[in-house]
Structure formats: structure tokens, C-alpha cells
Amino acid sequence: FERTRSLQDPCSNCPAGTFCDNNRNQICSPCPPNSFSSAGGQRTCDICRQCKGVFRTRKECSSTSNAECDCTPGFHCLGAGCSMCEQDCKQGQELTKKGCKDCCFGTFNDQKRGICRPWTNCSLDGKSVLVNGTKERDVVCGPSPADLSPGASSVTPPAPAREPGHSPQ
């Protein structure tokens, strides 16, 4: 014969937001303040995450779901569930062990996080440089030189202009 799940375990009737209270004959008690249970049938409630220090509260804790944090301005989330915050840099920079440093010549970063990446090599696609790259922006590749001057055999793409006053690290 088939037993229902509730006959096997009275705790299975306890919904999310409650816990099965062994101290009170296994009745379903609401989660205490600053705690939650996201699934039914739990014997304890989990402590809510507190968004302190560099963390800000993105979503408040409820009886059925944990709080969610993000980072204070000037920082961005790292890791699953924003487990850490890492400082932003400016566009045209990357975060090194020594803090935010300008991208080396020939590389760019158009975001406040991440690393500097090399400019696109237009000539690999048989194209020419239409707009030179900067620390903040990739080069813009244009039509191939042959497209620009019909009948011409091959034209060497112009080298990107070196940014004045910027030396590689």
C-alpha cells in the first residue's frame, strides 16, 4: 500500500517561509526575523545575508528568499551571487596589483572592469584602418585598400598613430 509523503514526514507539509519546529511537535513555525527558507519541508531557516561595508542591498531578505547584494558605486561584483566587490577603473585602464593603470599602447579597454585587449589587426582581414585606436576604443577597420582604389595591386594599411605623451609600461 502507498503512504503519502505527509504520513512519512509531517515536516514535508511545511511551506517555504516556515520551518518544522521539533520543539513544538513538528508544527510549522514562521521563520524568525532575519532568516528565510526558500523551500518547503526545512527543519531550520537560514540566516539572511547582510549587505554591509562595500556591499549594498539590491533585494531585501524575505521569509522565502535571501537578500541579494550588489556593490557600492565605484565597485563591481565578482563571483557567484556577488560574493566580492572589486574596484572599478576608468575606461582606458585595467586593474593591476598596483591599482588602475593605463592600457599600454596598442591595447584598449572600453569598460570600467576587465583587462586591456589588443587593437584589432585590420590587415589580417585584408582591411585598412579607418579610425585609429585609443586606450578606450578599438580601431575601426574600413574597406580593403583595393576596394578604395580600383586597379591598385596592394596598399599597406597605415600604422595607427602613436598617442602623444603615452609610453608603453
Partner: nanobody, 123 residues
């Protein structure tokens, strides 16, 4: 409970010195990078310095290089910031923060912060 508590701030004249301390508890201090940040009045948070688990690697923002020294005593679960040749622009609330454990892929990622200690440089 994981906790960081800063101390040692105060009022100091330009050119003077202060030593900030940060007492850590509730976690294995020697497993983590540690970081000092500061926030000047009306400004955003600024990274100042960080130090790896055994103290063999130390890094500083350019504006304090040669004037500030970060150090740690793992036996005492303590982080320090020795600040010399202080300037008016060093006036800020200074925070110590727990960094990565070496496996996080970031030397600047933080999760636990202290409440801060105020440093005022003025004549």
C-alpha cells in the same frame, strides 16, 4: 562573527605621522590578502594599499608610494598602515578590508570591511 576593527586615526599636522591598526577576528587572517581603502570628504572610495598573505607582496597607489607602509602580523591577526609625511590631501576615513584568499583571481576583490577610522591632516 567575521569582523575588522580599525583604530589609530586622529588629528595630525602636515608632515606628521600616524599608524593605523586593524584587528581581525572570526576568520583565518593569514589566509587572506588585506587591503586599505580611504574615502576623502565628498569623494569616492580609493584603494590605498594591499598586502598578500605572508607580507611578501605589497602594493600602493602612486600618491602614497614612499610615504605609507602596509604591514601585517599574522600571529596577532592585525593589519597596519604606517603613514609618514602626511599631507592635507590624505585627510579621509580609512577602511581596512579583507581581500581574496589567493584563489579568487582578484587581488582587489573584497568582502568584509571595518567601520573606518578618521584621519585629519591640518595645521
Amino acid at each position: 562573527e567575521v569582523q575588522l576593527v580599525e583604530s589609530g586615526g586622529g588629528l595630525v599636522q602636515p608632515g606628521g605621522s600616524l599608524r593605523l591598526s586593524c584587528a581581525a577576528s572570526g576568520f583565518t587572517f593569514s589566509n587572506y590578502w588585506m587591503i586599505w581603502f580611504r574615502q576623502a570628504p565628498g569623494k569616492g572610495l580609493e584603494w590605498v594599499a594591499n598586502i598578500n598573505q605572508d607580507g611578501s607582496e605589497k602594493y600602493y597607489v602612486d600618491s602614497v608610494e614612499g610615504r605609507f607602509t602596509i604591514s601585517r602580523d599574522n600571529a596577532k591577526n592585525s593589519l597596519y598602515l604606517q603613514m609618514n609625511s602626511l599631507r592635507a590631501e590624505d585627510t579621509a576615513v580609512y577602511y581596512c578590508a579583507r581581500g581574496g584568499d589567493g584563489y579568487s583571481g582578484s587581488h582587489h576583490g573584497t568582502d568584509v570591511w571595518g567601520q573606518g577610522t578618521t584621519v585629519t591632516v591640518s595645521s
